[in-house]
Interface confidence: medium
């Protein structure tokens, strides 16, 4: 229901209550003229009128409040309309980045291509806050997700797609860390941990790109 509809309903209710009030006032004067009208029922009617008057007052206040809220919302909507969304549809916004959790299962290289086609890169974890967010986001999934971390063989360092090295304080890569694979060793994240695996295997992936945080 829109605010304008709520406002109309309140106006209608206000009119009904005013009508009821007048009717009851009429009944009171009629009762006062009639000798058999008891003092008790007159008091009851007075009480009812007071209640109705109170309600009318409350409704008026409510209506005024809603009117102000409506104006504020319209103002906010105008401001929002002048800004574009920080992330494209289906992407998740967190901090400075947008994330897309793929539903297709591909090898690491193919996953990398898929992200590039979306003007993005595979997941890069820069901070513990990033790691916490990703772990939370995938905690209900059983499946592994490729991230943008790989190395040629065990004697090479772990590197992100942009060539920067993995900061050792962020996480420990588990699993096949000492294995050498012809296609290289790539890292995937599964629930609470990061694992090394043969890049040729298929897994889901997480794409990442900068969020659009500039106002138009």
């Amino acid at each position: 229901m829109q605010l304008s509809q709520v406002s109309d309903l309140l106006t209608q209710e206000q009119a009904n209550l005013t009508h009821q009030k007048k009717k009851l006032e009429g009944q009171i004067s009629a009762r006062q003229q009639a000798e058999e009208a008891s003092q008790e029922s007159e008091n009851e009617l007075k009480e009812m009128i007071e209640t109705l008057a109170r309600k009318l007052n409350e409704k008026s206040k409510e209506q005024m409040e809603l009117h102000h809220q409506n104006l504020n919302l319209q103002e906010t909507l105008k401001r929002v309309a002048n800004c574009s969304a920080p992330c494209p549809q289906d992407w998740i916004w967190h901090g400075e980045n947008c994330y897309l959790f793929s539903s297709g299962s591909f090898n690491w290289e193919k996953s990398q291509e898929k992200c590039l086609s979306l003007d993005a890169k595979l997941l890069k974890i820069n901070s513990t806050a990033d790691l916490d967010f990703i772990q939370q986001a995938i905690s209900y999934s059983s499946f592994p997700f490729w991230m943008g971390l790989s190395r040629r063989n065990p004697s090479y360092p772990w590197l992100w797609e942009d060539g920067s090295p993995l900061m050792p304080h962020l996480f420990r890569v588990r699993g096949a860390v000492s294995q050498t694979y012809p296609s290289g060793t790539c890292a995937y994240i599964q629930r609470g941990a990061v694992y090394a695996e043969n890049c040729i295997l298929a897994a889901f992936s997480i794409c990442q790109k900068k969020a659009n945080l500039r106002a138009q």
Epitope: S141, S142, A193
Partner: antibody, heavy 115, light 107 residues
Framework: QVQLQQSGAELVRPGASVKLSCKAL????????MHWVKQTPVHGLEWIGA????????AYIQKFKGKATLTADKSSSTAHMELSSLTSEDSAVYYC????????WGQGTSVTVSS | DIQMTQSSSYLSVSLGGRVTITCKAS??????LAWYQQKPGNAPRLLIS???SLETGVPSRFSGSGSGKDYTLSITGLQTEDVATYYC?????????FGGGTKLEIK
């Protein structure tokens, strides 16, 4: 309430294939992963793999790759597991179970491989 | 693969007594641990997830504890309906692995 109804017991010949089904009731089938577990007196409970009915994505344990194929039919809210090239080692009770973790289980399907 | 070891295959306990079932993982599993109860002829039933969270409808005499590699399922005030086999399972990383099970009997 949530229920997983599995197909009846199977007696199959060695080398044959069998397709087990698991019908999901009482929840949105595409929202939860469906997992399959094998139970034998010798090896106890063994996780076979899982399928996400929403995306069709599946994951298997290495041991069951080529042995088990997991599929999901969204229209009937039914998950299937096909076991191929059966041997006596495949004789077991197979359970389907909803994730996370395995909070609802089917009643189990007994598969006996015998000539 | 992460191996899950339940040190006792059988445990015999008196009615009303307290029992502790242990489970050890071959690597840290960050509390991604579940406990199941299975009675003969039935499917397993989830008792505890996340190492300590009791599932809805599970009696409060059951409790889970532990961290890192070592986890425990405790049952206080043992009742006849608790006679079953109990399994632990790690669900940090596939393949998800189960312990060998601990069969509980009444003395």
């Amino acid at each position: 309430q949530v229920q997983l109804q599995q197909s009846g017991a199977e007696l199959v010949r060695p080398g044959a294939s069998v397709k087990l089904s698991c019908k999901a009731l009482g929840y949105t089938f595409t929202d939860y992963e469906m997992h399959w577990v094998k139970q034998t007196p010798v090896h106890g409970l063994e996780w076979i793999g899982a399928i996400h009915p929403g995306s069709g994505g599946a994951a298997y344990i290495q041991k069951f790759k080529g042995k088990a194929t997991l599929t999901a039919d969204k229209s009937s809210s039914t998950a299937h597991m096909e076991l191929s090239s059966l041997t006596s080692e495949d004789s077991a009770v197979y359970y389907c179970t909803r994730w996370l973790p395995m909070d609802y289980w089917g009643q189990g399907t007994s598969v006996t491989v015998s000539s | 693969d992460i191996q899950m070891t339940q040190s006792s295959s059988y445990l015999s306990v008196s009615l009303g007594g307290r029992v502790t079932i242990t489970c050890k993982a071959s690597d840290h599993i960050n509390n991604w641990l579940a406990w199941y109860q299975q009675k003969p002829g039935n499917a397993p039933r989830l008792l505890i997830s996340g190492a300590t969270s009791l599932e809805t409808g599970v009696p409060s005499r059951f409790s889970g504890s532990g961290s890192g590699k070592d986890y425990t399922l405790s049952i206080t005030g043992l009742q006849t309906e608790d006679v079953a086999t109990y399994y632990c399972q790690q669900y940090l990383i596939t393949p998800y692995t189960f312990g060998g099970g601990t069969k509980l009997e009444i003395k």
